[in-house]
């Protein structure tokens, strides 16, 4: 049995330009200790979308549901979506260290943007 699962329940989300997109992610545990970060794309060129403690992400808001008893919610909402936001978003768990070590990624959620 896996010690930690990172779950992105939606394979894809479609949002009209100008609206907000909610990207859902849950982890089965806070252990191992370390942050969850959101990225768009994969590999060395991926774009950091949200980090709880570092950086400034004015369009991104955490929207977790703290009432979820059986897992931890790390969902985010991105406001004022534009066509440039299209892509696949990954919720990624890191193990705390110097530096933090990437441990596990969700399967990804593809965001598509419809015209207004």
């Amino acid at each position: 049995e896996e010690e930690l699962q990172v779950i992105q329940p939606e394979k894809s989300v479609s949002v009209a330009a100008g609206e907000s997109a909610t990207l859902n992610c849950t982890a089965t545990s806070l252990i191992p200790v370390g942050p969850i970060q959101w990225f768009r794309g994969v590999g060395p060129g991926r774009e950091l979308i949200y980090h709880q403690k570092e950086g400034h992400f004015p369009r991104v808001t955490p929207v977790s549901d703290p009432t979820k008893r059986n897992n931890m919610d790390f969902s985010i909402r991105i406001s004022n979506i534009t066509p440039a936001d299209a892509g696949t978003y990954y919720c990624v768990k890191f193990r705390k260290g110097s530096p933090d070590v990437e441990l596990k990624s969700g399967a990804g959620t593809e965001l598509s943007v419809r015209a207004k």
């Epitope: 010690e3 545990s29 806070l30 252990i31 191992p32 200790v33 929207v63 977790s64 703290p66 008893r69």
Partner: antibody, heavy 118, light 111 residues
Framework: EVQLVESGGGLVKPGGSLRLSCAAS????????MSWVRQTPGKGLEWVAT????????YYPESVKGRFTLSRDNAKNSLYLQMNSLRAEDTAVYYC???????????WGQGTTVTVSS | DIVMTQSPASLAVSLGERATISCRAS??????????MHWYQQKPGQPPKLLIY???NLESGVPDRFSGSGSRTDFTLTINPLQAEDVATYYC?????????FGGGTKVEIK
């Protein structure tokens, strides 16, 4: 019904060792993060050690790091705390506690008393 | 380390009245919209029992006269109305960052 039953406490001299055990039942032990928390009249509740559900990751506060070792046997639904180089300040009631999400302590055992004294 | 300061250390409240316990963390315990602050009740000779998880969520089986509120560094546990079986010591606990830490406890008695 969830049950956590600690054992192994007792009186030990400073510098000595003890091994505490916690027998779990009534829940899927292998899915839970498990911890030990101790309680003293003077210091209140103090987190002592935590182990991930599969046993890969362990965490300790500086007060016990290098002296205490936490392990688990999921096949036996059991948790173990090996305590070496014991000091008078380790005297406490030791509770075994479960954490489904590695956050709040869901369930606690009744505790086992460790006394370190010459 | 995150230091948890509970107040008052003891509290005497009349039956049927409101009891309010405060807990202040030395730094924010919030992350991703969760407040990693929890409350426990401990009666003499018993282990602690989870009452409230993540600041405001009532644990299953806990009476709804218990409630929790707060965010970032300031949190409150309220018992309203206080009943005789609520006489106990109450502890706050943060799991936002290691080492996990507890408040010093608040002893609730009947006036």
């Amino acid at each position: 019904e969830v049950q956590l039953v600690e054992s192994g406490g007792g009186l030990v001299k400073p510098g000595g060792s003890l091994r505490l055990s916690c027998a779990a039942s009534g829940f899927t032990f292998s899915s839970y993060v498990m911890s030990w928390v101790r309680q003293t009249p003077g210091k209140g509740l103090e987190w002592v050690a935590t182990i991930s559900s599969g046993g890969t990751y362990t965490y300790y506060p500086e007060s016990v790091k290098g002296r205490f070792t936490l392990s688990r046997d999921n096949a036996k639904n059991s948790l173990y705390l090996q305590m070496n180089s014991l000091r008078a300040e380790d005297t406490a009631v030791y509770y075994c506690a479960s954490q489904l999400t590695g956050s709040e302590f869901d369930y606690w055992g009744q505790g086992t008393t460790v006394t370190v004294s010459s | 380390d995150i230091v948890m300061t509970q107040s008052p250390a003891s509290l005497a409240v009349s039956l049927g009245e409101r009891a309010t316990i405060s807990c202040r963390a030395s730094e924010s315990v919030d992350s991703y919209g969760n407040s990693f602050m929890h409350w426990y009740q401990q009666k003499p000779g018993q282990p602690p029992k989870l009452l409230i998880y993540r600041a405001s969520n009532l644990e299953s089986g806990v009476p709804d006269r218990f409630s929790g509120s707060g965010s970032r560094t300031d949190f409150t546990l309220t018992i309203n109305p206080l009943q005789a079986e609520d006489v106990a010591t109450y502890y706050c606990h943060q799991s936002a960052d290691l080492p996990w830490t507890f408040g010093g406890g608040t002893k609730v008695e009947i006036k």
